[in-house]
């Protein structure tokens, strides 16, 4: 059952390598690299290497195995995050709060300014920063959907936990709808899941950037983990396919 | 950027077809075809046939693609139904009808009789034949927990529709529960979605096998297509790796 | 699973994936990739050793057939199964970017 | 996508997935399986035309990329992408079974 | 079809000031860094800064440092480099060249001569 | 400021030969180096970025190798509209400088 041929594996990995070099440039569709002469000194700034660490980390709830991809998705996806509105923000005044929800809101302007189109986003998700928990909670995901009511999106059942940990839920359909619309705010609500017989449904996880009474210091570390939405989108020059062996900002 | 061999597509077509040979075979753990000298005359038995034609279709909820396959499942799954416990059955009496739950009830020796061993088990699903459906309704899966508890499994939006229509649920980790625990029956309630807010909180969706008041003759055909669970598992045998150049029963 | 789990630890000669770090500056003469400083790439390598005619005693070799052959093709193959996303950063002039590029990191494979 | 739709409709020399009817009586000489008859299996067959050197032009062969060669492979092979499986009923005995079998249609191909 | 087309030549008396237009067409302006670079009779090119049309950020090479000033006018997709205390060395034929981030300059204006003199 | 050191600073000729132009860098460029033809009255033209890239339009007699500070531009036939000056440009580092060039003269 053998091949009965050697297999010379320096050359293989040679060829691999090869095959690499052609795959990372094919995938950002750059002929060559770009040059580094204007590169500022230093290390990377904090909030790129904050989103290189989110795409990074795979966070509960997201698949750990891609799907078999399509053409399209063979190219490179430009990473973005948009933080949602600080909680003092008056459109917050228009929800009253309650014991089984938290509302989150997000300025379409700047996820406009990140995906200027909405054929072009691949993936968006919203991340959440759960603090420790007690008890197990089942959670609901909503999308605002006109003046006061809102869409069911997904669910998740939340186990308990000592330490904070990142959640993900997906959320493309939803931001793409955003990138069509004219709104200027648009939102999520995450509440308890409520069952038809049981009364009591108060939200028991602690989400960041929601809790109050802090101090400064404290207060700003909080409000950079606050929820988020981590857009990945073919940038619009890519997509033009003008990019040919140009490196187009 | 040619290969520079002609291709003997026949010859290709030839080793494909043998290749299927063995497959098959070896999926089914059999050295050689089973001897047909005992097959009884005429068609295929109408259960038989309704159980290929379940397997065959695919069902909303369904994933259409398959992941890619862990060992265990290289080899072929015998595929069984059990039909959900009528309704006329005194367990259905513990639970109060309301407007927005129905429940489903099924026998876990006649799951043991299909599936012997929990770790034989490769799916489950429950399947339901929805019938036409005029609004939008979300609804939920529970599984009967302790006495008088649910646990949340999962959950669909059923479009509206004018055609009834099979959907799927995956229940494979409840049912490998069930057959390692010494219950008699075991069941789940499909639920309307209730929100926090929202009041009206009624199972719109009907559901074939519970609804009442039928001539005889329609009640039969309506009862074969009640609520079922089908199940993939290994054979015992097979698993048991006893079969090799032996067709055990 | 031909995964990094069996394969790294073994000395199977078929189908298997095989380890391969990629650093970005040695490996390739490049700089210009901030994040990461490189990547286990890894890859497919190894026979899938199947051979199939009329005359084949079927018992012999179905044993076989679900490592070497599961999808019965007619010349099996060692590809990838299980991969994985890469995340990069890197500047486009003075602007830098954070691109997630998919199926870059080879977890497992299989003979196909 | 190298799938039935586009390999089908075209004359593509490359990868792509091939129309392959099993006929169980006629091409296997099988009579046990009683449904169904037989099956669309298709199969997978082309070259994935990609040659990488160091003094490879990049510009030219980049855009090839995506459908030669995407998993970056020292030499890429035209295998299955997306696979379904197969319920058959046959008897054992006098006892009839249905069974399904995973991965046993090709649907898609790719050069992997 | 990418073009670059540059202004006529000038001449000049020492210590006077030449600003040398360069109008772009075929493609999106801000997209790109639009850079100068000169060259003296005879002698070799010579990089003198560049402006991003975008976002109005200016780079210059030392020696032209106060000398020099890069503006643009993206409203008509124009470059412009004025020299100011103009010495005879300064003639040369000036040329401003797209930039592309891969390292190269892909695109050139036909160049305009400048020459001072007094 | 990295030096860019091209050789020979001129050369003879004729239609149909093989001319080889190098340009060293003082340190290494990571294969940032890019070749220029200048004629006389004539835009500047980009022939080869990133070493051995050609840019579109450019004819396959051009080819560019090379890696860490030695660069080469090899014409393999030398045709009439070749004859010009010939010129290397490193895009690796600030500021970005040039060879002193090469006159490419028919015998």
């Known amino acids: 059952l053998s091949t009965c041929k050697t297999i010379d594996m320096e050359l293989v990995k040679r060829k691999r390598i090869e095959a690499i070099r052609g795959q990372i440039l094919s995938k950002l569709r750059l002929a060559s690299p770009p040059s580094q002469g204007e590169v500022p000194p230093g290390p990377l700034p904090e909030a790129v290497l904050a989103l290189y660490n989110s795409t990074r980390d795979r966070v509960a709830g997201e698949s750990a195995e891609p799907e078999p991809e399509p053409e399209a998705d063979y190219y490179a996806k430009e990473v973005t995050r948009v933080l949602m509105v600080e909680t003092h923000n008056e459109i917050y005044d228009k929800f009253k709060q309650s014991t089984h929800s938290i509302y989150m809101f997000f300025n379409t302007s700047e996820l406009r300014e990140a995906v200027p189109e909405p054929v072009l986003l691949s993936r968006a998700e919203l991340r959440l920063l759960r603090l420790k928990l007690k008890v197990e909670q089942h959670v609901e995901l909503y999308q605002k959907y006109s003046n006061n009511s809102w869409r069911y999106l997904s669910n998740r059942l939340l186990a308990p936990s000592d330490s904070p940990e990142w959640l993900s839920f997906d959320v493309t359909g939803v931001v793409r709808q955003w990138l069509s619309r004219g709104g200027e705010i648009e939102g999520f609500r995450l509440s308890a899941h409520c069952s038809c017989d049981s009364r009591d449904n108060t939200l028991q996880v602690d989400i960041n950037g929601f809790t109050t009474g802090r101090r400064g210091d404290l207060a700003t570390i909080h409000g950079m983990n606050r929820p988020f939405l981590l857009l990945m989108a073919t940038p619009l020059e890519r997509a033009q396919h003008l990019q040919s062996s140009r490196h187009r900002r | 950027l040619s290969t520079c061999k002609t291709i003997d597509m026949e010859l290709v077509k030839r080793k494909r077809i043998e290749a299927i040979r063995g497959q098959i075979l070896s999926k089914l753990r059999l050295a050689s075809p089973p001897s047909q000298g005992e097959v009884p005359p005429g068609p295929l038995p109408e259960a038989v046939l309704a159980l290929y034609n379940s397997t065959r279709d695919r069902v909303a909820g369904e994933s259409a693609e398959p992941e890619p396959e862990p060992e265990a499942d290289y080899y072929a799954k015998e595929v069984t139904r059990v039909l959900m416990v009528e309704t006329h059955n005194e367990i259905y009496d513990k639970f109060k009808q309301s407007t927005h739950s129905i429940y489903m009830f099924f026998n876990t020796s006649e799951l043991r009789e299909a599936v012997p061993e929990p770790v034989l088990l490769s799916r489950a699903e429950l399947r339901l034949l929805r019938l036409k459906l005029k609004v939008e309704q979300h609804v939920e899966l529970y599984q009967k927990y302790s006495n008088n508890s649910w646990r949340y499994l999962s959950n669909r939006l059923l479009a509206p529709s004018d055609s009834p229509e099979w959907l799927s649920f995956d229940v494979t980790g409840v049912v490998r529960q069930w057959l390692s625990r010494g219950g008699e029956i075991e069941g789940f309630r499909l639920s309307a979605h209730c929100s926090c807010d929202s009041r009206d909180n009624t199972l719109q969706v009907d559901i074939n096998g519970f609804t009442t008041g039928r001539r005889g003759d329609l009640a039969t055909i309506h009862g074969m297509n009640r609520p079922f669970l089908l199940l993939m598992a290994t054979p015992l045998e097979r698993a048991q790796h006893l079969q090799s150049s032996r067709h055990r029963r | 699973a031909l995964d990094t789990n069996y394969c790294f630890s073994s000395t199977e000669k078929n189908c298997c994936v095989r380890q391969l770090y990629i650093d970005f500056r040695k490996d390739l003469g490049w700089k210009w990739i901030h994040e990461p400083k490189g990547y286990h790439a890894n890859f497919c390598l190894g026979p899938c050793p199947y051979i199939w005619s009329l005359d084949t005693q079927y018992s012999k070799v179905l044993a076989l057939y679900n490592q070497h052959n599961p999808g019965a093709s007619a010349a099996p193959c060692c590809v990838p199964q299980a991969l994985e996303p890469l995340p990069i950063v890197y500047y486009v002039g003075r602007k830098p970017k954070v691109e997630q590029l998919s199926n870059m990191i080879v977890r497992s494979c299989k003979c196909s | 996508a190298l799938d039935t739709n586009y390999c089908f409709s075209s004359t593509e020399k490359n990868c792509c997935v091939r129309q392959l009817y099993i006929d169980f009586r006629k091409d296997l000489g099988w009579k046990w399986i009683h449904e169904p008859k037989g099956y669309h299996a298709n199969f997978c067959l082309g070259p994935c035309p990609y040659i990488w050197s160091l003094d490879t032009q990049y510009s030219k062969v980049l855009a090839l990329y995506n459908q030669h060669n995407p998993g970056a492979s020292a030499a890429p092979c035209c295998v299955p992408q997306a696979l379904e499986p197969l319920p058959i009923v046959y008897y054992v005995g006098r006892k009839p079974k249905v069974e399904q079998l995973s991965n046993m249609i090709v649907r898609s191909c790719k050069c992997s | 079809e990418v073009q670059l087309v540059q202004s006529g030549a000038e001449v000049k008396k020492p210590g006077a000031s030449v600003k040398v237009s360069c109008k772009a067409s075929g493609y999106t302006f801000t997209s790109y860094d639009m850079h100068w670079v000169r060259q003296a009779p005879g002698q070799g090119l010579e990089w003198m800064g560049r402006i991003d049309p975008q976002s109005g950020g200016i780079r210059y090479a030392q020696k032209f440092q106060g000398r020099a000033t890069l503006t643009v006018d993206t409203s008509t997709s124009t470059a412009y480099m004025e020299l100011s205390r103009l010495r005879s060395d300064d003639t040369a034929v000036y040329y401003c060249?797209?930039?592309?981030?891969?390292?190269?300059?892909?695109?050139w204006g036909q160049g305009t001569l400048v020459t001072v003199s007094s | 400021d990295i030096q860019m050191t091209q050789s020979p600073s001129s050369l003879s000729a004729s239609v149909g030969d093989r001319v080889t132009i190098t340009c060293r860098a003082s340190q290494d460029i990571y294969s940032y180096l890019n070749w220029y033809q200048q004629k006389p009255g004539k835009a500047v033209k980009l022939l080869i970025y990133?070493?051995?890239n050609l840019e579109t339009g450019v004819p396959s007699r051009f080819s560019g190798s090379g890696s860490g500070t030695d660069y080469t531009l090899t014409i393999s036939s030398l045709q009439p509209e070749d004859f010009a000056t010939y010129f290397c440009q490193q895009g690796d580092t600030l500021p970005w400088t040039f060879g002193q060039g090469t006159k490419l003269e028919i015998k």
């Open positions: 990133y070493t051995s």
């Open positions: 060249a797209r930039w592309d981030y891969g390292g190269y300059f892909d695109v």
